[in-house]
């Protein structure tokens, strides 16, 4: 089976690696622009230089290309708690991340929010906090896990999933209620 190629891939595949086919003359292969630059003008003929210009401030290209414009630098989303790890350069996009003792929660492939790692109060750390995953906690006796926090079994209602973990405590609470004591 031959893989389906898009028009740009078809055009590029005619030329050797590092070159692309001239859009107006398919007998000419032009050298691609280096990262950090973009295509200003196609090469006028075989063996002649492609006119590449450096990306302007606030834009970049991270690989060799024949793009007519550089890509806009990403901005770290302060409202999502993101901080800038490294600023944008002509050949590398901005790198955004989270502060120490925080992890990333991805709302989508490209959008993440920073959250504080759980400290496992009233429990122990089962798995340490990682870049993209919160700490995994194991709760002490008399506590159950709710939204990755160890909550006292006194907050466990019969309708919740905590009933199995907190069964003795629930029975005690029920017994107290039945006896009429305060």
């Amino acid at each position: 089976l031959v893989p389906h190629l898009g028009d740009r891939e078809k055009r590029d595949s005619v030329c050797p690696q590092g070159k692309y086919i001239h859009p107006q003359n398919n007998s000419i292969c032009c050298t691609k622009c280096h990262k950090g630059t973009y295509l200003y003008n196609d090469c006028p003929g075989p063996g002649q230089d492609t006119d590449c210009r450096e990306c302007e401030s606030g834009s970049f290209t991270a690989s060799e290309n024949h793009l007519r414009h550089c890509l806009s630098c990403s901005k770290c989303r302060k409202e999502m708690g993101q901080v800038e790890i490294s600023s944008c350069t002509v050949d590398r996009d901005t790198v955004c991340g989270c502060r120490k003792n925080q992890y990333r929660h991805y709302w989508s492939e490209n959008l993440f929010q920073c959250f504080n790692c759980s400290l496992c109060l009233n429990g122990t750390v089962h798995l340490s906090c990682q870049e993209k995953q919160n700490t995994v906690c194991t709760c002490h006796a008399g506590f159950f896990l709710r939204e990755n926090e160890c909550v006292s079994c006194s907050n466990c209602k019969k309708s919740l999933e905590c009933t199995k973990l907190c069964l003795p405590q629930i029975e005690n609470v029920k017994g107290t209620e039945d006896s009429g004591t305060t």
Epitope: W107, N110, N148
Partner: nanobody
Framework: EVQLLESGGGLVQPGGSLRLSCAAS????????MGWVRQAPGKGLEWVSL????????YYADSVKGRFTISRNNSKNTLYLQMNSLRAEDTAVYYC???????????????WGQGTVVTVSS
Amino acid sequence: EVQLLESGGGLVQPGGSLRLSCAASGFTFARYNMGWVRQAPGKGLEWVSLIDPSGGHTYYADSVKGRFTISRNNSKNTLYLQMNSLRAEDTAVYYCGKPVFSDWPAVEFDYWGQGTVVTVSS
């Protein structure tokens, strides 16, 4: 057919509270991020809050942080927005929906409701 039906809006005095509900049907509610946006008179749409499928992660716009609480009940296919300490600037049409994040912070939804009006006035 996907349906999202908001309710709970109304007229409230500054400092008062309201609880908005959003009943969802026609899709697997429990699998998706959900959110609330609002549109104040003569203004554009703005994000208010987001919640992930489990309810364990939430996002709030700075303007509502500490006053609004988003929650969900997946067994009832319902999204909620508890609004406390309401201010005149919270006056808007509030919409719930299933968000898309292709161009954050632009507001985009796959599905959204018809909206519920919240008016904060003395």
